[in-house]
């Protein structure tokens, strides 16, 4: 495939990445799959600057990101190291709360109304943000 040099229509370019902001809600796994089908991934926040950019675009709305601990350790969907990476949890989060009564704890991370992160039940239908890097090879065949 060819290297992507500009963002697809309706995506927003920022710091060599392209972002797409949903206006509807999906469960985390469905949001994750949506982004993958777009040759992208749920947003991976690697800096305070990127956090502010995403926060500005989503507003005060619960929004999924590409961070989960469904297998135990916290993991970013693109393989970015959680331990050494940027974190912006709300105070006392993540808490893996069981009190919702839906079964299990809380395994998926989202932006809250103030932008800081919370873990929540992955089945909740929140908005989501997809991200893809401009410098990565596209799956699409090159234009002739």
């Amino acid at each position: 495939g060819s290297e992507r040099t500009c963002c697809p229509v309706n995506w927003v370019e920022h710091e060599r990445s392209c972002y797409w902001f949903s206006r509807s809600g999906k469960a985390w796994a469905d949001a994750d799959n949506y982004c993958r089908l777009e040759d992208a991934h749920l947003v991976v926040v690697t800096s305070w600057e990127e956090q502010k950019f995403v926060q500005h675009h989503i507003g005060p709305v619960n929004t999924w990101m590409g961070l989960h601990d469904q297998n135990g350790p916290w993991k970013w969907v693109d393989g970015t190291d959680y331990e050494t990476g940027f974190k912006n949890w709300r105070p006392e989060q993540p808490d893996d709360w069981y009190g919702h009564g839906l079964g299990g704890g809380e395994d998926c991370a989202h932006f809250t109304d103030d932008g800081r992160w919370n873990d929540d039940v992955c089945q909740r239908p929140y908005r989501w943000v997809c991200e893809t890097e401009l410098d990565k090879a596209s799956q699409e065949p090159p234009l002739l």
Partner: antibody, heavy 114, light 107 residues
Framework: EVQLVESGGGLVKPGGSLRLSCAAS????????MNWVRQAPGKGLEWVSS????????YYADSVKGRFTISRDNAKNSLYLQMNSLRAEDTAVYYC???????WGQGTLVTISS | DIQMTQSPSSLSASVGDRITITCRAS??????LAWFQQKPGKAPKSLIS???SLQSGVPSKFSGSGSGTDFTLTISSLQPEDFATYCC?????????FGQGTKVEIK
């Protein structure tokens, strides 16, 4: 490398007390719930207690409720289990485990005998 | 409390065999199930979480399946290092509960 190291086990008389510690390293301790799980000699695993990342939520098995207290110190990357009114049936290897058990310590043996 | 029942409690098998261990929950637990391996005198090792997700570093000869109340752990080709005790655990709700274990021995 993720490491959990338990300490504080030993031989105690029935009715006595013991405090177990678990020192964590190699991961962001404050991002994870932590647990104590025990295994009596020749028996299966038994969940004992869990504590959320910031101690907001604490859970106990009925068999230890009112006698055991779980706590943590995120500044010290440490998990604790205060065990009071110990009984012979509390004799076991006690393991500390992260989240749902993705990593475990090597265990510390607690023996309750007169 | 949710009871977890494993079968068989023990089995004998040869190197190269494919084996399956079953775990049944007394009520539906969706996919909130983990599998562990334990060798004598050692701490348990996590193999699978969320019923079918292989833990990092665990070889692909291990696989898990199931949802609701019935779950299986399969080892596709037993190797000498796989002879151990295997147990399941539900984390759907507190108190978390374990199966009684299945001891896999050399035939």
């Amino acid at each position: 490398e993720v490491q959990l190291v338990e300490s504080g086990g030993g031989l105690v008389k029935p009715g006595g007390s013991l405090r177990l510690s678990c020192a964590a390293s190699g991961f962001t301790f404050s991002s994870y719930s932590m647990n104590w799980v025990r295994q009596a000699p020749g028996k299966g695993l038994e969940w004992v207690s869990s504590i959320s990342s910031s101690s907001s939520y604490i859970y106990y098995a009925d068999s230890v409720k009112g006698r055991f207290t779980i706590s943590r110190d995120n500044a010290k990357n440490s998990l604790y289990l205060q065990m009071n009114s110990l009984r012979a049936e509390d004799t076991a290897v006690y393991y500390c485990a992260r989240d749902r058990g993705s990593c475990w310590g090597q265990g510390t043996l607690v023996t309750i005998s007169s | 409390d949710i009871q977890m029942t494993q079968s068989p409690s023990s089995l004998s098998a040869s190197v190269g065999d494919r084996i399956t261990i079953t775990c049944r929950a007394s009520q539906g637990i969706s996919n909130y199930l983990a599998w562990f391996q334990q060798k004598p005198g050692k701490a348990p090792k996590s193999l699978i979480s969320a019923a079918s997700s292989l833990q990092s570093g665990v070889p692909s000869k291990f696989s898990g399946s199931g949802s609701g109340t019935d779950f299986t752990l399969t080892i596709s080709s037993l190797q000498p290092e796989d002879f151990a005790t295997y147990c399941c655990q539900q984390y759907h709700s507190y108190p978390w509960t374990f199966g009684q274990g299945t001891k896999v021995e050399i035939k």
